[in-house]
Interface confidence: low
């Protein structure tokens, strides 16, 4: 988890002088409770946005937006703490909006946004906005939380982001797998425009089961430039095991931008359909 760039982070708007600060995720109003605290945020919305860095790279970011309730508690609102928690790692990052002037009611509802939390493809986050100061220990909560799922690199807009492109999202190998005679598979795929090696990982399974009955790895050396974008054809010999008929072929590239952590592509060959055993037809028709 990180913030996008080191460019100035802005939270000021007409009628409010505000600054964005790094936060330890532990505002001191927990330690020094106040008697009067603001109400919770209203209508918290989290959306996937895309932002360019100063170097021109494109990153997915969480666009966080919320409004204030129209009650008198805005007179005691000193700012907000924005927290993003990555659920699979428990990593948390926070920033604090610090209001440098008092809020006043005006003809529009106060609205705040922040779009600088960089998020990763295929990850889930919990986003929390806490109004400050935080409530006394037994006070009503004044925060709102929402979960936010970031699409993976197959998503059309995600595919062209820097983290996805770095992991090889623009490569479409268009894998085809063909069953040949004599327990063989022919795997064909399109090479990318980089002189890097590939691995084909073959895993075979029984018809209805998920434990493997055969595994094989095949190394493909780095292609020459004239072979870029050409089809590579590899014939793999299967183990002659009855019922070991469902094959998953996975192609792992080793692009320089992602090394051994590149997106893998796979294709599956199902077991052949077994024809239903027909009822035997008697040689004669009984008369009774």
């Amino acid at each position: 988890l990180r913030l996008l760039d080191h460019r100035a982070l802005v939270c000021s708007q007409p009628g409010l002088n505000c600054t964005v600060k790094n936060s330890t995720c532990l505002d001191d109003s927990w330690i020094h409770p106040r008697n009067l605290t603001p109400s919770s945020p209203k209508d918290l919305q989290i959306q996937l946005h895309f932002a360019h860095t100063q170097q021109g790279d494109l990153f997915p970011v969480a666009h966080i937006e919320w409004t204030l309730q129209t009650d008198a508690s805005i007179l005691y609102l000193e700012g907000a703490e924005l927290s993003v928690l990555q659920l699979n790692t428990n990593e948390r990052l926070c920033v604090r909006f610090e209001f440098l002037s008092k809020l006043r009611h005006h003809h529009r509802r106060w609205r705040f946004t922040f779009s600088h939390f960089v998020v990763d493809p295929d990850q889930e986050y919990e986003v929390t906005v806490h109004h400050l100061p935080k409530p006394i220990p037994d006070g009503d909560p004044n925060h709102q939380s929402k979960n936010f799922l970031v699409p993976d690199c197959e998503h059309a807009r995600m595919k062209v982001t820097t983290p996805c492109m770095s992991s090889g999202s623009l490569w479409d190998p268009n894998i085809t797998v063909e069953t040949l005679e004599a327990h063989q598979l022919r795997v064909s795929f399109t090479l990318w425009n980089e002189s890097t090696h590939y691995q084909i990982l073959l895993t075979s399974f029984p018809h209805m089961e998920n434990h493997s009955c055969f595994e094989h790895m095949h190394h493909i050396p780095a292609p020459r430039p004239e072979e870029f974008h050409q089809r590579s054809n590899v014939t793999l010999t299967l183990r002659n095991l009855k019922g070991c008929c469902r094959h998953q072929v996975q192609i792992q590239p080793f692009f320089s931008s992602c090394l051994n952590d590149c997106l893998r592509h796979s294709a599956t060959v199902s077991c052949p359909e077994m024809p239903d055993t027909p009822e035997p037809i008697p040689d004669y028709m009984p008369l009774w």
């Epitope: 990180r2 170097q55 790279d57």
Partner: nanobody, 118 residues
């Protein structure tokens, strides 16, 4: 091992000038953006300037535009920061850093202290 060694800091009066240098080793210097970042006493880290691999593109934080100039010499594996018209608010430890395209910096050198005071 990547190493970045900054030098050239010191005490200077408001309006004065300093030239910071950073000597890099342990990586292919000419293939990286380089940055200067700074940390004022008791404050967070602030990005100051970036320079592209071949020096063809430079970027500055608004507060130093027109006063600071970043440059590099790939033959000497060095990056420089020429600081003119220095102000008290430029007082900070200045770090040279290897910049990644995401806008984040790793690793940093040990820093050189610039103090602007009369």
């Amino acid at each position: 091992e990547v190493q970045l060694v900054e030098s050239g800091g010191g005490l200077v009066q408001p309006g004065g000038s300093l030239r910071l240098s950073c000597a890099a080793s342990g990586f292919t210097f000419s293939t990286y953006w380089m940055s200067w970042v700074r940390q004022a006493p008791g404050k967070g880290v602030e990005w100051v300037a970036n320079i592209k691999e071949d020096g063809s593109e430079k970027q500055y934080v608004d507060s130093v535009k027109g006063r600071f100039t970043i440059s590099r010499d790939n033959a000497k594996n060095s990056v420089y920061l020429q600081m003119n018209s220095l102000r008290a608010e430029d007082t900070a430890v200045y770090y040279c850093a290897r910049a990644y395209s995401s806008g984040w910096f790793d690793p940093w050198g040990q820093g050189t202290l610039v103090t602007v005071s009369s």
